[in-house]
Each structure stands twice: as C-alpha cells, then as structure tokens.
C-alpha cells in the first residue's frame, strides 16, 4: 500500500506522457489523477513503466472503480492486464469481441493463464453462447481452447460456430468432447456433397457411431489411418472387413503396420481369418474358419 | 530371400501402351502389397499406386487414374502394371517394389520404358 | 496432396564426417494414438533400386548400418550419417506413406569432399 502523501509543486501530471516514467512510486500515487489516467489508457502501453510503477497505476484504478472498470478502460490495459487477478476480471463486463482480442494479444504466445481462462469464461457467459466470431478469435489464440471445454460447455456451441474450428483445434479432445461436438458438425456441413463433407468432417469423426462410419465406407472416402485410430473402439469393432477395406481405401495396407494398436488390434480379434485374408496383409488372430460367434451381450439382455 | 524380377526394357512409339510384369519369390506373395513407382531420367521418385495381391484391388495416384492398370497372377506370383496413350514424358525406369507395411522394403531390379518416334 | 521438401540438394562431406539431411512435410505426419510418424527413408545408389533405410521416421531397417539414423516428429524430419563411408555416396529420398498419393522428397545427393 503507497503512502498518501502530496505532490510536490509542479509535479501534478498534465497528461500521461513519457515524463512519469522519472516519478518514484508515491510521485505517481500523488500526482497522477486516477480520472486521467483511465481516459489515457491507450497512452500507458507506449511508456516503458516498471513493474512497480504499473502497480501503483492499477492501484490508481481499483480506487477509481472499486465494483470492476468499464469496458472503456478494459479495452486499453494492455501490459497492465498481466497485473490483474482473476478476482479482479470477475467484476468486468466484457461485451465487445476488440476488447477481447486486444487483451489476449497482450498474452499471445504464452499458456493460457488464470487471468485469460476468466476473462474468456466471463466473456462466453455474457454473451450467452459460443458464437462463430468468438471461437474464431479463441481459436486463433489458443488452438487447444475447444479440447478445453467440458462437454457440457460444448453443448452451448451452435452448430453454425464448427465452421471456424480447424483440424489442429480438435487435436487434444477426447472421446466425450467429441461425442458432443461430432452431431454438431454433422449437422453443419450436411448440405455439402461427398468428398467435401468428408474433409470437413474427418476432425470430427472420433465422436461417430457406427451407422455414420457404415454410411461412409459407401462413399470412396479412403480415409488415412490416423484418422481411423481416433475412431470410437465401439463404432469401429462392428465394422466388417469389407466395410474398412471401403472406408480405408489405399490406407487399409496400413492396418499391418499398426496392428499392435488399438482400435486395430481389438477389430482384428473381432473378424473371421478368412475374412482377414482377403485384405492381403497377411494379418493373424482372426477368428479361426468353421467357429461360431456367440454375442454373450445380447445373451444378456434376453436373460 | 524376397527377389523381384521385372521384365526387360521396352522401347515405344507414342499412343501406345506398356505392360511391365514383376515375379516375385522369397516370400507368401498374397501377404504384401505390391507398389510401382517411376523415375524419369536424372529424376525423383513418383509413386503410381498399389495393389492388393489377395483381392486384386488396385488403387492408383489420380495423375494416372485414366492410363494404369495394375492387375496381379497369383498362380505365378506375378504384379502387372499397364500403362497406356505412352508420351514422351512417361520415359522412365518403372520400378515394382513390395511393401513392408506401408514403406517399400524390397524393389525390382527395374524396366526402363522409352518413348520416342 | 502433402509435399515433401528436401534440404540441402546436395551435400559434400569428408570421409568420417557427420552428413545431415533434412525433409519437411506440408503437413503432420504423426498418428497421435500409435505415435508412428509416417516418413521413410531411402538410399539410391548410381545405377542401382533404392533400398529402404529408415521407416516410422526412425526405425532402421534391418542389416542397415547403424551410422544412419532418423529423427524428428509432425512435419520436421532428419537423416543423419554420423560417419560418411565411401559406400555412402548415394542419392537420399524421404517419403511419406501417410496419406495417398504417397509423395517423395525431391533427393539430396551425398558426395566425399
């Protein structure tokens, strides 16, 4: 906490200029008006401050808006926002998609911070939904923002926002977040035609169940292995080897190459050897010809 | 010991086709999927496509879609590709190569193909 | 289609020296759930088939010297001779095999100094 302590004779700051930066910390605290100072904001970031000096600053601020800043100051923190705490944010309003971008360039080519992560939630929570504009803008910043999200803050993204979602955002999601995100996107690009539907729907297609990956194995899609391997092992087991050789194309002769992994390894013990056979690979632990295959699942359910 | 043998050299007039075989021994020839690939002179390497030996399900490099064929003899464990409307450009050294899981193990020895009037 | 770009085109190295070539793809090659990239390395003497080296990125092919060696992850890939042998002087080529059309770098020419 500075002192309060008065301004010496002609010291009283005019205007935020370049001169302040020569004040010691109770110069600033006495002669810099806190009304000025938050309708010159935008002249803060071009003055080299200390550390210690954009402290008093925000001292200055919090004095002057004890129930949170307007909007008009928010926009023009720069650097000044790195000093701010995510108790501080939670008493902003954030509304406009420049201020948001203006304050997560001040972070850009960091970590997502605490501050960031609040600023974001209170800017998605005022504005109901996660629009395209905005995940466009998250994205841009933080490409691993979607794979953030908990499912149930996915379920607020309208289907018209996945346009703006790129392969690499979806890069760290798991199975439950793209269980949420996968009928979305189907929704999205359902009115494109086949091999476009399929590009813009292959990031997707980890939350697919087995129906839609039967529906595309119709379509000559030939998707790449590593696509494949993020399918859901449950909408891949059901799958019939004349099925992946049509939704692998060329890529099936792949399947060798990784048949230690799963879903690969798991969909092998499911088929028949002979079944196996016809894909060339010379692929072993198929299910012995002249064996009977018991569903013990349906069994269950009868009994 | 994995051996592919591909057919000699073969001189052509332009509009005309190809056909390159490739024997294969050494190895379960229904087991690995077969590759061609071309090298024209002081060139890189351009792959053509590949094949199913068990099924004979090809798959071809869009470039050649319309002129290759790749078809396969199991009785003579023997890879063919076809290639036809021959031009000039399509002087190269046609090579079959055996695949190891997706990368190419083994190679013919391969067929110089030379297109002139 | 994904490129594959080779760097340098050629290289001249002493005998015993090390000889680094790089390949860059245009776009990932790894496979996230087996952690496999999909890059393999070939060698191609004068006159003769290329023989495989490297596959999976750094995996070396057996009864390849280990003087060769592949690195990198994603996009970024490296061969490396850690002691040029006169056997050496070949044409190299990186290839991926991860989604068709499989594409070859353009070939970096190996030579003694």
């Known amino acids: 906490e500075v002192e309060k302590t008065a301004c010496p004779s002609g010291k009283k700051a005019r205007e935020i200029d370049e001169s302040l930066i020569f004040y010691k910390k109770w110069e600033l605290e006495a002669c810099v008006d806190a009304a000025l100072l938050a309708t010159q904001m935008d002249r803060v970031n071009a003055i080299p401050f200390t550390y210690e000096q954009l402290d008093v600053l925000k001292h200055k601020l919090d004095e002057l808006y004890p129930q949170g800043y307007p909007e008009s100051v928010i926009q023009h923190l720069g650097y000044l926002f790195l000093k701010m705490s995510p108790e501080d944010i939670r008493k902003w309003n954030v509304t406009s998609l420049e201020t948001l971008k203006a304050l997560l360039e001040v972070n850009k080519g960091h970590e997502m911070s605490p501050q960031v992560a609040t600023l974001i939630d209170r800017f998605v929570k005022g504005r109901g939904q996660l629009d395209k504009d905005t995940l466009d803008t998250l994205t841009a910043f933080y490409p691993g923002y979607l794979c953030s999200l908990s499912p149930e803050e996915l379920s607020s993204v309208p289907p018209s926002s996945i346009w703006a979602v790129r392969p690499q955002d979806l890069d760290t999601c798991d199975p439950r977040q793209l269980d949420v995100l996968y009928p979305k996107a189907r929704l999205a690009f359902q009115n494109m035609n086949g091999s476009e539907y399929f590009v813009k729907i292959q990031s997707f297609l980890g939350g697919a169940p087995t129906e839609d990956l039967k529906a595309l194995s119709q379509q000559n899609v030939s998707m790449d292995l590593a696509t494949f391997m993020k399918l859901r092992t449950d909408a891949v087991l059901p799958l019939t080897v004349a099925e992946v050789q049509k939704l692998l194309g060329p890529h099936v002769e792949g399947l060798k190459a990784e048949e230690r992994h799963r879903p690969v390894r798991d969909w092998i013990l499911r088929q028949r050897q002979d079944d196996l056979d016809t894909l060339g690979l010379g692929l072993q632990g198929g299910i012995p010809n002249g064996y009977l295959v018991l569903d013990l699942s349906m069994q269950e359910a009868l009994s | 010991e994995v051996q592919l043998v591909q057919s000699g050299a073969e001189v052509k007039k332009p509009g005309a086709s190809v056909k390159v075989s490739c024997k294969a021994s050494?190895?379960?020839?229904?087991?690995?999927?077969m590759h061609w690939v071309r090298q024209a002179p002081g060139q890189g390497l351009e792959w053509m496509g590949n094949?199913?030996?068990?099924?004979?399900?090809?798959y071809y490099n869009e470039r050649f879609m319309s002129r290759v064929t790749m078809t396969v003899d199991k009785s003579t464990s023997t890879a063919y590709m076809e290639l036809s409307s021959l031009r000039s450009e399509d002087t190269a050294v046609y090579y079959c190569?055996?695949?190891?899981?997706?990368?190419?193990?083994?190679w013919g020895q391969g067929t110089l193909v030379t297109v002139s009037s | 289609d994904i490129v594959m770009t080779q760097s340098p085109d050629s290289l001249a190295v002493s005998l015993g020296e090390r000889a680094t070539i790089n390949c860059k793809s245009s776009q990932t090659l790894l496979n996230s759930v087996s952690q496999n990239n999909y890059l393999a390395w070939y060698q191609q003497k004068p006159g003769q088939s290329p023989k495989l080296l490297i596959y999976?990125?750094?995996t070396r092919e057996s009864g390849v010297p280990d003087r060769f060696s592949g690195s990198g992850s994603g996009t970024d890939f490296t061969l490396t001779i850690s002691s040029l042998q006169a056997e050496d002087v070949a044409v190299y080529y990186c290839?991926?095999?991860?989604?068709?059309?499989?594409?070859f770098g353009g070939g970096t020419k190996v030579e003694i100094k």
């Open positions: 050494g190895y379960t020839f229904t087991n690995y999927w």
């Open positions: 999976f990125a750094s």
């Open positions: 094949i199913n030996p068990s099924s004979g399900d090809s």
């Open positions: 190569a055996r695949s190891g899981g997706l990368w190419l193990a083994f």
């Open positions: 290839q991926q095999h991860y989604r068709t059309p499989y594409t």
